[in-house]
């Protein structure tokens, strides 16, 4: 399956955060909300598929609670009245830990993937096509909320890149009721005229190989890896790049390359036998200086969950972990457009690219 | 025939400035990685800087950052070594070259270099 | 910065004689190491690439091999006109450095 035609990501919204479903849930719908559980305040987030903003409708709530061990409540609320609690006494989260959270719409449910494994299936008690709405309260930061719309397209193996048929441009500022914490950037740095989400499948209309598993039950089935993809029209400032995974738990590296022809723009390097993310770039077989620095402790952690937003400027690229700014890296190759090919290798296993 | 020619050395007083060109016949200086490597008299050789102009690079020495600035003509097919405040150290023997490249390799080996011209810095 | 120490600085040789030029990297270069020859008041000339690749017009009798951080540049049989400076330059690592250079001489 191959998607195209997809709503542009919320980039680090604010939380509380209401945000506009452009053409509301369809069947083959992904959404997925990445971020971190905050550590300090709260026992509880949400995530809500509603019809409008008011919170009376929601055809979907899915409710973490780290309360009497951890559980996970799913309802529904229609005209303002909760329905029977579906209750999974599993807790996938972990508190101060980031995650990446998927929801596929289906004819008869929701499926809840939480970082690239099957969590829950919630049946629908109210028609999805109401929804147009997507909210997220309690103690969570977000890095991104996405969408994928399904088309079906003749898919090359391994993934698949469609480009839009129509630019497509971010959506008002949500409706965030605080500030985004220090350190994030502004969620809509300018329009975005392409987005490409990277699936991938291992035969014509299976999405993996697992011959067991029904196609399009995991929407993040495992990257290929390396993975290699193309960035179509090569950066550009305001260009976005959204990559989420989970770190081995024996991981020692791994790298996201950005790359011009025989050269690499950019190499991002988590190194955990150095406990250092390093930056550099490579011409002609030739490496630069590295750039090591960083404000905080290394944010890849082995067997942890991760996301990576690279955002390139006029000047540079800025790179955020988890929602959180951690560098910037000034452009050694400045003609951006001719930097147009993404490599990702090395000890993690993809589970979201969007380029 | 590839060639190389460079020119503009000469005799200057410290912190005075110079402009070095490297005229390219032969290939196209836009695609290629032009390098400026200096040998001071009686010494060995040491890079300078580099230039990739499609792919909009450059890259300079440690000891010329911030003094010398590399670039391309490509509708002139040269490129330029501007140095600014120019020291005694800097006297030297100034060659430009092309990296060698092919289909099996790429790197920063210079298989073509200039005849070389002589810049002395002093007083 | 990655250091090139390149040995022996100076040596004679007869015509004739096989001739080893060592170079050690200070850290691991890959294979990315050139050897050039340089004649006084010419400017240098491509002999090796890619530590062993020979380049195109260049004699047999020259030679490049690596093993780990040391890089070797071997004339099978000195000839007249190879009496020259030798250096070796690694790309691995920005800055590109060279070799402080040997000269063969003759005995």
């Known amino acids: 399956m191959a998607f195209s035609g997809s709503q542009a990501p919320y980039l680090s919204p604010a939380v509380p955060f209401s945000g506009t479903i452009q053409g509301g849930l369809q069947d083959g719908l992904q959404i997925t909300v990445n971020g971190t559980v905050l550590s300090s305040s709260g026992t509880r987030f949400a995530v809500n598929f509603q019809t409008g903003f008011s919170g009376n409708d929601i055809a979907f709530h899915f409710n973490p609670r780290f309360e009497d061990g951890g559980y996970v409540v799913c309802n529904t609320r229609q005209n303002g009245s909760w329905g029977p609690e579906e209750r999974k006494t599993h807790m996938p989260f972990q508190k101060g830990m980031p995650f990446d959270l998927c929801f596929l719409v289906q004819s008869s449910d929701f499926k809840v993937m939480v970082n690239g494994i099957l969590f829950v299936q919630y049946f629908h008690r109210v028609p999805f096509h109401r929804v147009d709405t997507i909210s997220v309260n309690g103690s969570v930061q977000l890095s991104y909320i996405s969408f994928q719309n399904p088309r079906t397209v003749p898919v090359q193996p391994a993934f698949s890149t469609v480009p839009f048929s129509q630019p497509v441009c971010f959506p008002p500022r949500p409706r965030g009721r605080r500030q985004k914490p220090p350190g994030v950037w502004p969620a809509n740095p300018a329009p975005i005229t392409q987005t490409v989400i990277h699936t991938v499948q291992s035969a014509p209309g299976q999405m993996f190989s697992t011959p067991a598993i029904p196609p399009m039950m995991y929407p993040h089935p495992a990257y290929p890896m390396p993975f290699i993809t193309t960035i179509l029209g090569g950066l550009y400032p305001s260009k976005s790049i959204l990559l989420s995974g989970t770190v081995l738990p024996s991981a020692q590296r791994f790298h996201i390359n950005l790359c011009s022809g025989n050269h690499i723009a950019f190499h991002l390097n988590p190194r955990f036998d150095e406990n250092a993310v390093v930056r550099n770039t490579q011409i002609d077989n030739s490496w630069g200086s590295e750039e090591r620095s960083l404000p905080r402790k290394m944010p890849f952690v082995r067997g942890q969950s991760f996301s990576v937003w690279i955002l390139c400027e006029a000047h540079c690229l800025k790179v955020a972990v988890d929602g959180q700014h951690l560098f910037e890296y000034y452009h050694r190759l400045r003609n951006l457009p001719t930097i147009n090919r993404l490599e990702v290798g090395g000890d993690i296993q993809l589970t979201h690219v969007q380029t | 025939e590839v060639q190389l020619v460079e020119s503009g050395g000469g005799l200057v007083q410290p912190g005075g400035s110079l402009r070095l060109s490297c005229a390219a016949s032969?290939?196209?200086?836009?695609?290629?990685?032009i390098h400026w490597v200096r040998q001071a008299p009686g010494k060995g050789l040491e890079w300078v800087a580099s230039?990739?102009?499609?792919?909009?690079?450059?890259s300079y020495a440690d000891s010329v950052k911030g003094r010398f600035t590399i670039s391309a003509d490509t509708s002139k097919n040269t490129a330029y070594l501007q140095m600014n405040s120019l020291r005694a150290e800097d006297t030297a023997v100034y060659y430009c070259?092309?990296?060698?490249?092919?289909?099996?390799?790429?790197?920063?080996?210079?298989?073509?270099w200039g005849q070389g011209t002589l810049v002395t810095v002093s007083s | 910065d990655i250091q090139m120490t390149q040995s022996p600085s100076s040596l004679s040789a007869s015509v004739g004689d096989r001739v080893t030029i060592t170079c050690r990297a200070s850290q691991s270069v890959s294979s990315a190491v050139a050897w050039y020859q340089q004649k006084p008041g010419k400017a240098p000339k491509l002999l090796i690439y890619s530590a062993s690749s020979l380049y195109s017009g260049v004699p047999s009798r020259f030679s490049g091999s690596r093993s780990g951080t040391d890089f070797t540049l071997t004339i099978s049989s000195l000839q007249p006109e190879d009496f020259a400076t030798y250096y070796c330059q690694q790309w691995s690592q920005s800055p590109v450095t060279f070799g402080q250079g040997t000269k063969v001489e003759i005995k």
């Open positions: 070259a092309r990296s060698y490249s092919s289909e099996t390799h790429y790197g920063w080996a210079m298989d073509y």
């Open positions: 032969g290939f196209t200086v836009y695609s290629s990685s």
């Open positions: 230039i990739y102009s499609s792919y909009g690079y450059t």
